[in-house]
């Protein structure tokens, strides 16, 4: 069974998938469509790296540009380094500027909805 066929079988169960499952799925060549991606739990999507989302969505990653104002895409973009976002070739803006340090202050982030940054 190839990645696409596997994805069709598990698609209906993905809504509540934790981050670890999504990370594992990103290694399976599933090419998840954007509509399914946007139904995932925001807290499960946020920790994914640009490389992992790129692998998870495959060719559909191109659609992130059109959905950059919608959750969880918007929130995910804010968590990524701008350098990494640039590799997607979509002109996405709003990532963490180069040279900034991301502090994993869970309480701060829970309250503000954005990561805490220390300038260069």
């Amino acid at each position: 069974m190839n990645g696409s066929e596997y994805f069709v079988k598990i698609q209906s169960f993905l809504g509540g998938a934790p981050t670890e499952d999504l990370k594992a799925l990103s290694q399976q060549n599933v090419s998840m469509d954007l509509a399914t991606f946007m139904k995932l739990r925001t807290d499960a999507v946020l920790p994914l790296t640009v490389a992992e989302v790129q692998k998870l969505l495959g060719p559909h990653v191109e659609g992130l540009k059109a959905e950059e104002r919608h959750r969880p895409v918007r929130d995910w973009i804010l968590r990524q380094r701008q350098d990494d976002l640039d590799t997607l070739g979509l002109g996405l803006q709003g990532g963490i500027p180069n040279g900034y340090l991301v502090l994993d202050l869970s309480m701060q982030e829970a309250l503000s909805g954005t990561p805490c940054l220390l300038g260069p």
């Epitope: 090419s31 469509d33 954007l34 509509a35 946007m38 139904k39 790129q54 495959g58 060719p59 559909h60 191109e62 659609g63 540009k65 059109a66 959905e67 919608h70 959750r71 640039d86 590799t87 997607l88 070739g89 979509l90 002109g91």
Partner: antibody, heavy 115, light 113 residues
Amino acid sequence: QVQLQQPGTELVTPGASVKLSCKASGYSFTSYWMHWVKQRPGQGLEWIGNINPSNGDTFYNEKFKNKATLTVDKSSSTAYMQLSSLTSEDSAVYYCARGWLRDYWGQGTTLTVSS
Amino acid sequence: DIVMTQSPSSLAVSVGQKVTMSCKSSQSLLNSSSQKNYLAWYQQKPGQSPKLLVYFASTKDSGVPDRFIGSGSGTDFTLTINSVQAEDLADYFCQQHYTTPYTFGGGTKLEIK
């Protein structure tokens, strides 16, 4: 203004390969993926695949996986599509088109495969 | 693969008339999270390359005349041309960009009487 420039025609013999070009101007080349589309008279439009000019990632329609190879040259803002083992079935107009919405298209290259 | 079916395959109308063409997809193109339908309409005039008219089923691209109206959701979509002009002579294609391979309808050829 946005422009995608393609050569008008290519004439090649069966069994040979050809590399079609698409020179982009008027926008940031690495901010939009490039798509390639085939059009044969009376057969509609077929999506061949796309390429991320930023990192060279490519994705193909399964039907064209062994036929087309997509590449880019960032320094010249040019996308390329190589077609191999050409037959008369490959005679068609080939378009490059910008981005997910295909909002700008090249004028197309008419490829004729004939001995 | 998602199959896109357009109808009619051709139609002939007089200048000033209203035209409606249909596009149906074999599965829903609606992203329920953003309420966007991943469907576009293109116009291809004789001897020219396709031109984007409408995206997300109903959003007109810049510079497209107001007489072109896209509508529909899910699997059923319509392109309406109010008061057809002579320059609207063209083939009209719908295309889904919900999932790869991205697929096009067979087209509707608009002829002017």
